[in-house]
């Protein structure tokens, strides 16, 4: 799996989308998990409704929400009030029994708020991530 980079601004919301084959993953619940390092285990953050037919209902864990368009085949995760500690590797997963298939690997990058002048001399202009030359970046 290639890694898709999603960049958000500190304090704002970031929406992450994970497209998938709706037929292949028919009847499967989905989950969003946080990976501890590039090779680390993935810790579940939030999953879709226990009843697959109700997957369109938004489920929340703290500042993270998940909703699934099972017909269109798009899982959407929203991270509200993005903070520096939200940065890192995540995965969108499709669940079946005790197994989980990776739908997408995601790197969330948190950019400093350009309107926050506390660090005006240290404004960070995001560039390409050195570790992911071929990564796809979405804003």
């Amino acid at each position: 799996h290639n890694t898709t980079v999603f960049q958000g601004v500190e304090g704002q919301s970031l929406q992450v989308s994970c497209p998938y084959d709706s037929m292949k993953h028919w009847g499967r619940r989905k989950a969003w998990c946080r990976q501890l390092g590039e090779k680390g285990p993935c810790q579940r953050v939030v999953s879709t409704h226990n009843l697959w037919l109700l997957s369109f209902l938004r489920r929340r864990n703290g500042s993270t929400a998940i909703t699934d368009d099972t017909l269109g085949g798009t899982l959407t995760i929203t991270l509200r009030n993005l903070q520096p500690h939200d940065a890192g590797f995540y995965q969108c997963q499709s669940l079946h029994g005790s197994e989980a298939d990776t739908l997408r690997k995601v790197l969330v990058e948190v950019l400093a708020d350009p309107l926050d002048h506390r660090d005006a001399g240290d404004l960070w202009v995001p560039g390409e991530s050195e570790s992911f030359e071929d990564a796809h970046v979405e804003h």
Epitope: Q35, L36, G37, E38, K39, G40, P84, H85, A87, G88, F89, L107, E109, V110, A112, D122, W124, S129, E130, S131
Partner: antibody, heavy 120, light 107 residues
């Protein structure tokens, strides 16, 4: 018991090469990145490079590019660091270090260190 | 390469003191900073990862904070076993780089 065990101390002449080994026990090196870090006497820590044993991909600090070679043998769960064209300033303790990579690894294992002395 | 600058380079303190070590990165590194403790003749030991997360088994008197370019390691009440050298390391990009170290000595 999870540990990294390194090969013994080496004394080398300037211009020679040295190969230090690092054997993992209690875990599989494919699940980790193996880094090499060195420390000259009385000095700080210096990152040399890493290998992803699963992919065979390695990356080096610019200072060591072309002179250091990091390899891994997954069948024996051993990583190696070879440094060529040795000079006196390469005298240092060389550590191997396993983690899950950048972006928040919670795993962190270190070898006991291998002293490499370069002297004519 | 990202340069990591620690201050002070050494400090003298007494048991029970509150000790603060700072680390400045030459570029924005988000929260990708680790703190290590090293004692003479021993390998480094991870104390803090991701700027503020305490590694397993590390006493709660150690804490880390910061994001972006400025980071702090605090020892709330220095214990005899805490006299050592402390290093910060960035994990945002390769090559990984360490600060030059801060030696904490007995006053």
């Amino acid at each position: 018991q999870v540990q990294l065990v390194q090969s013994g101390a080496e004394v080398k002449k300037p211009g020679a090469s040295v190969k230090v080994s690092c054997k993992a026990s209690g875990f599989s090196i494919e699940d980790f990145y193996i880094h090499w870090v060195r420390q000259a006497p009385g000095q700080g820590l210096e990152w040399m490079g890493w290998i992803d044993p699963e992919q065979g991909e390695s990356k080096y600090a610019p200072k060591f590019q072309g002179r250091a070679t990091i390899t891994a043998d997954t069948s024996t769960s051993t990583a190696y660091m070879e440094l060529s064209s040795l000079r006196s300033e390469d005298t240092a303790v060389y550590y191997c270090h396993a983690d899950h990579g950048n972006y928040g690894s919670t795993m962190d294992y270190w070898g006991q260190g291998t002293l490499v002395t370069v002297s004519s | 390469d990202i340069q990591m600058t620690q201050s002070p380079s050494s400090l003298s303190a007494s048991v029970g003191d509150r000790v603060t070590i700072t680390c400045h990165a030459s570029q924005h590194i988000n929260v990708w900073l680790s703190w290590y403790q090293q004692k003479p003749g021993k390998a480094p030991k991870l104390l803090i990862y991701k700027a503020s997360n305490l590694h397993t088994g590390v006493p709660s008197r150690f804490s880390g904070s910061g994001s972006g370019t400025d980071f702090t390691l605090t020892i709330s009440s220095l214990q005899p076993e805490d006299f050592a050298t402390y290093y910060c390391q960035q994990g945002q990009t390769y090559p990984r780089t360490f600060g030059q170290g801060t030696k904490v000595e007995i006053k």
